[in-house]
């Protein structure tokens, strides 16, 4: 009678197992082992019983025993079972990013594995189990169909296979692919709302604001501003799910003409567009030309004002004639123009809107001097003693400079309050000068007596 | 960390008894061919008893066969060497060793009998 | 008198080559049975230092080798150091005496 031990073994592959080969006989002509895997004796003393070290077993394998006996010939088998854990361990590649409301399907595929009888593919949601089936095929496939949510938001979804081999007493074999991470969004259907001025003035800045409501997670969602190719650098401030996203935008000349402003909003793999045009303009303030800015009584001057050439400009409220980007006017310099202001107004039409520019120069006439009666009375009588002002005033472009003498050394104290006196009396010449020239005038101080009674 | 740790040795008198123990850890001793080995003072080593995993099968030396016992309790992780008829030639000092199948691969710290009158 | 026969005693100088043989019979090395090689320091336990004729269990340094020819066996330890001043034995089977047999054992010094 032949025997084996142990009868079953459950073993990793590539493992090694001893196995007893035993007879009931003392003096067996014959015992030993048959088996395709590797095997070696043990040095052992005895005829009756031989043990093999069977070795890299890597698959299911029926070794058996035989031995040859005075009583006849008989054999043993025993059972070896291998184990091992799936080599790969999959879920199908997914985007991360997925809209809430999508039905998303899982994929988990496994290779490998063995006793497939103990294995079991799981698919979880964190630790939540979603399905729960045998492995069978090769690879074998398990899938489930999952609604996503808002609050699946940053779930990990694995897959997982348990080789249990606690009935065998050995332990659950547990092997976790790399987990899926979901990203969920909402992005509305609606563009992104984007508030700028239609119209740019070159070498100038301008705000843009653009947002968009409805989003989740709004601190995921990346918003592009641009203006052409210029990439704007905006702002970005969040509410709960929406956001505003605020830059300003420099223009120079180079971008002059029609320019496509635009708002890209992207979040996962879908985004969001609003296109606008902004009209980039270049209107520089007219320039208003005199002859001469400084002229002197009587001379001609011609006042010139000139703008953009597709400008319409008024002269002092006068509008150019045709109306157009030149306007001019002529007039013979009088003292009353010194100070004058000239001012050009320019309009110009861009993209359907108004836009105005102004320039003033003013003129400086020069005239004088001038002494005459109203300013300057020839005939003063003050009472002695009483508190007089004396006033000459002169006239002229620039300020003359006056000054009074009696006898040509005794002066009158112009401007200034003074108490009548005896010394007072007599005619003073009055002297204005300037760099136009000069003018003189008499003016007589009369001095009365008190009445004694 | 495989140990064995051999006790009961000293001295005893020609035709007297000692039973010596090797207790184990570190390993499954039940699944472990255990044997002793002994040494006389200044010579070589020699092997003396074997018994299998289970003490199904016992094996001796010629020159102890009949005076000695192997034996083993797997419940408690000890192997056993009962020595009966000592004599002086038996003076040595005895190691246990774990046998792998073909080489003695871990051995004890071994314990002196000496055998003297 | 020890079935297998070792040298009594071997020497050597530090870095020098010295080889310890081991002979057996027709019954034991001669029949393929493996040759063993342990080690004993001085004042301690034997300690496998080589098994299945030329293997080293993990921690004996590569100086040591074992090889195996017909009924003979042997055992070069090469870069030799102080540390390997110790007794050396040779161990096999012995299908005749079913039993297991040890060399007498070589007592190497490092001169």
């Known amino acids: 009678q032949t025997s084996v031990s142990p009868s079953k073994v459950i073993l990793p592959r590539g493992g090694s197992v001893l196995v007893t080969c035993s007879t009931s006989c003392d003096q067996p002509k014959l015992l030993g082992i048959e088996t395709p895997l590797p095997k070696k004796e043990l040095l052992l003393p005895g005829n009756n019983r031989k043990v093999y070290e069977l070795s890299n077993v890597q698959e299911d394998s029926q070794p058996m025993c035989y031995s040859n006996c005075p009583d006849g010939q008989s054999t043993a088998k025993t059972f070896l079972t291998v184990y091992w854990t799936p080599e790969r361990v999959e879920l199908a590649p997914l985007p991360s990013w997925q809209p809430v409301g999508k039905n998303l399907t899982l994929r988990c595929q496994v290779e490998g594995g063995a006793p497939r009888a103990n294995l079991t593919v799981v698919l979880l949601r964190g630790e939540k189990e979603l399905k729960r089936e045998p492995a069978v095929g090769e690879p074998a496939e398990v899938t489930t169909t999952v609604l996503v949510r808002r609050d699946h938001h940053g779930a990990n979804f694995s897959c997982r296979t348990e080789l249990d081999l606690r009935p065998q007493g050995l332990e659950l074999f547990e092997n976790t692919s790399a987990p899926y991470q979901l990203q969920t969004f909402v992005l509305p259907a609606t563009p992104p709302q984007l508030v700028s001025p239609r119209v740019l003035e070159v070498d100038t800045q301008g705000t843009v604001v653009c947002s968009l409501d409805g989003l989740f997670p709004v601190s995921e969602a990346q918003v592009h501003l641009a203006l052409g190719d210029q990439r704007l650098n905006p702002t970005v401030t969040y509410g709960n799910d929406s956001f505003s996203a605020k830059a300003s935008v420099s223009v120079t000349a180079e971008d002059e003409g029609t320019q496509r402003l635009t708002c890209a909003v992207i979040l996962g793999n879908q985004s969001q567009e609003t296109l606008q045009t902004v009209t980039i303009y270049s209107f520089p303030a007219p320039n208003v030309i005199l002859t001469k800015p400084e002229v002197s009584e009587g001379t001609e001057v011609t006042v010139k004002c000139e703008a953009h050439p597709r400008a319409k400009v008024t002269l002092n409220g006068v509008p150019a004639q045709p109306l157009g980007p030149r306007a001019q006017l002529l007039l013979k310099a009088t003292p009353e123009d010194n100070g004058r202001s000239f001012s050009c107004s320019a309009t110009l039409e861009v993209a359907g809107q108004l836009i105005h520019k102004n320039q003033t120069r003013e003129l400086r006439v020069l005239y004088g001097p001038r002494l005459d009666e109203r300013d300057c009375p020839g005939n003063w009588t003050w009472p002695e003693n009483s508190q007089q002002t004396p006033m000459c005033q002169a006239w002229g472009n620039p300020l003359p400079e006056l000054k009074c003498l009696k006898d040509g050394t005794f002066p009158l104290p112009i401007g200034e309050s003074v108490t009548v006196t005896r010394d007072l009396e007599g005619t003073y010449l009055c002297r204005a000068r300037s760099t136009q020239g000069e003018v003189t005038r008499k003016v007589t101080v009369n001095v009365l007596s008190p009445r004694y009674e | 960390e495989v140990q064995l740790l051999e006790s009961g040795g000293g001295l005893v008198q020609p035709g007297g008894s000692l039973r010596l123990s090797c207790a184990a850890s570190?390993?499954?001793?039940?699944?472990?061919?255990m044997s002793w080995v002994r040494q006389a003072p200044g010579k070589g080593l020699e092997w003396v008893a074997f018994?299998?995993?289970?003490?199904?099968?016992?094996y001796y030396a010629d020159s102890v066969k009949g005076r000695f016992t192997i034996s083993r309790d797997n419940s408690k992780n000890t192997l056993y060497l009962q020595m009966n008829s000592l004599r002086a030639e038996d003076t040595a000092v005895y190691y246990c060793?774990?046998?792998?199948?073909?080489?003695?691969?871990?051995w004890g710290q071994g314990t002196l009998v000496t055998v003297s009158s | 008198q020890s079935v297998l026969t070792q040298p009594p005693s071997a020497s050597g100088t530090p870095g020098q080559r010295v080889t310890i043989s081991c002979t057996g019979s027709?019954?034991?090395?001669?029949?393929?049975?493996?040759v063993h090689w342990y080690q004993q320091l001085p004042g301690t336990a034997p300690k496998l230092l080589i098994y299945?004729?030329?293997n080293r269990p993990s921690g004996v340094p590569d100086r040591f080798s074992g090889s195996k020819s017909g009924t003979s066996a042997s055992l070069a330890i090469s870069g030799l150091r102080s540390e390997d001043e110790a007794d050396y034995y040779c161990?096999?089977?012995?299908?005749?005496?079913?039993?297991?047999?040890f060399g007498g054992g070589t007592k190497l010094t490092v001169l």
């Open positions: 027709s019954s034991n090395i001669g029949a393929g049975y493996d």
């Open positions: 060793a774990r046998y792998s199948g073909w080489y003695f691969d871990y």
């Open positions: 161990q096999s089977y012995d299908s005749s005496l079913s039993a297991w047999l």
């Open positions: 570190g390993f499954t001793f039940s699944n472990a061919w």
């Open positions: 299945d004729n030329n």
């Open positions: 018994i299998w995993y289970d003490g199904s099968n016992k």
